[in-house]
């Protein structure tokens, strides 16, 4: 039901400035998803810029199945995962390595979902039960967003109603919180 399959297609983008972001993803199960880590060597001198357009962000395409109770989509859907840390575009390596290669001394820039798309999905059910039609919200693009101290202190809470779609394999958090763990709304869903 979680991350059923994926394609590790890393795309480097230089996204535009936008509205308040969804909180960035903190994916828990990195065994089931091939998450791209920033790779390469650290620069000799700290890179500082105030222009977000100079920061680049990695989009990973992956596929997953949509489920609803015992029912599952006939075909997987494809969406993006926005790979955590943003780095200076000119220093972003072509190869995906493992090491953390750049750490800003100033404000934190995160790679977060920018645009979403809705997709209608037909789910097939066992035991002769009628198929179900559902809509899912998929990440369509990512962007770099400067996180202020407020963002960090508020644990990246939702800034708008249309904020987050939780990652599969995680506890859902859109507009809600777990009854057992009284945690912040939309806790790190994105």
């Amino acid at each position: 039901q979680g991350w059923q399959a994926f394609k590790n297609d890393a795309t480097e983008i230089i996204p535009e400035l936008g509205e308040y972001p969804e909180p960035p993803p903190e994916l828990e199960n990195n065994k089931t998803m091939n998450r791209a880590e920033n790779g390469g060597r650290p620069p000799h001198h700290p890179f500082e810029t105030k222009d977000v357009s100079e920061y680049s962000c990695r989009e990973l395409h992956f596929t997953r199945y949509v489920t609803d109770g015992p029912c599952r989509s006939a075909k997987p859907v494809t969406e993006l995962v926005c790979s955590g840390q943003c780095g200076p575009a000119r220093l972003l390596p072509n190869a995906i390595g493992r090491g953390k290669w750049w750490r800003p001394s100033g404000p934190d820039f995160r790679c977060i979902p920018d645009r979403y798309r809705a997709q209608r999905v037909q789910l097939l059910c066992p035991g002769g039960e009628a198929p179900r039609a559902r809509k899912v919200r998929l990440v369509a693009s990512c962007k770099c967003k400067r996180l202020t101290r407020f963002h960090n202190q508020s644990e990246l809470k939702d800034f708008g109603t249309e904020a987050a779609r939780p990652q599969k394999g995680r506890k859902p958090r859109p507009r809600a919180r777990s009854a057992k763990a009284n945690q912040a709304e939309l806790e790190n869903a994105y």
């Epitope: 039901q1 949509v66 489920t67 609803d68 109770g69 015992p70 809705a118 209608r120 039960e129 009628a130 179900r132 039609a133 559902r134 809509k135 899912v136 919200r137 109603t161 249309e162 779609r165 939780p166 990652q167 599969k168 995680r170 506890k171 859902p172 958090r173 859109p174 507009r175 809600a176 777990s178 009854a179 057992k180």
Partner: antibody, heavy 122, light 107 residues
Framework: EVQLQQSGADLVKPGASVKLSCTAS????????IHWVKQRPAQGLEWIGR????????TYVPKFQGKATITADTSSNTAYLQLRSLTSEDTAIYYC???????????????WGQGTSVTVSS | EIVLTQSPALMAASPGEKVTIACSVS???????LHWSQQKSGTSPKLWIY???NLASGVPVRFSGSGSGTSYSLTISSMEAEDAATYYC????????FGSGTKLELK
Amino acid sequence: EVQLQQSGADLVKPGASVKLSCTASGFNIKDYYIHWVKQRPAQGLEWIGRIDPDNGESTYVPKFQGKATITADTSSNTAYLQLRSLTSEDTAIYYCGREGLDYGDYYAVDYWGQGTSVTVSS
Amino acid sequence: EIVLTQSPALMAASPGEKVTIACSVSSSISSTNLHWSQQKSGTSPKLWIYGTSNLASGVPVRFSGSGSGTSYSLTISSMEAEDAATYYCQQWSTTYTFGSGTKLELK
């Protein structure tokens, strides 16, 4: 802010038809399913059906087939419920609701309109 | 059609009292498809708990939900005046069906 604004109360005569509206703000109805529910005075909730405004495809409970027609106009971000051949049994409050998108494999109506009261009386 | 039966239909609780509302389903459903709504007199319903146990935004943590298969419940650990309302269980599989509702009053 997500809101569903429904049309005002209606007093209609038996045998007539009525068309209720549900205008969305804060989201695009094309991206969601819109549901309609009936609540008779001092009674429970009854699902009528839903529509996918993106393609106009609607689903109904058998009981409401022929009685209700759900349509949508994406240009005005509005969904409609038309009720025909009205009788006293149709006197109720009708609510529209939005089916939330993908709550991590949970699907439920997460926002409701304020309701439209329909009274059928001669 | 799946039928949801709620019990009790009407109950009264004192402030601080623990409250449990039961919802019995005519045939087994996935816990992801069972939800609860709260409705106060003269207002529209509000999604209260979704997927059996997940609280919707703004719902106090004194509320909880549990269950599986054909038996589900909503629990308030300590009744407060603002909790007086009618609670509906509902399931959404191929059709949306609601329980008949439990009216909870303040004693």
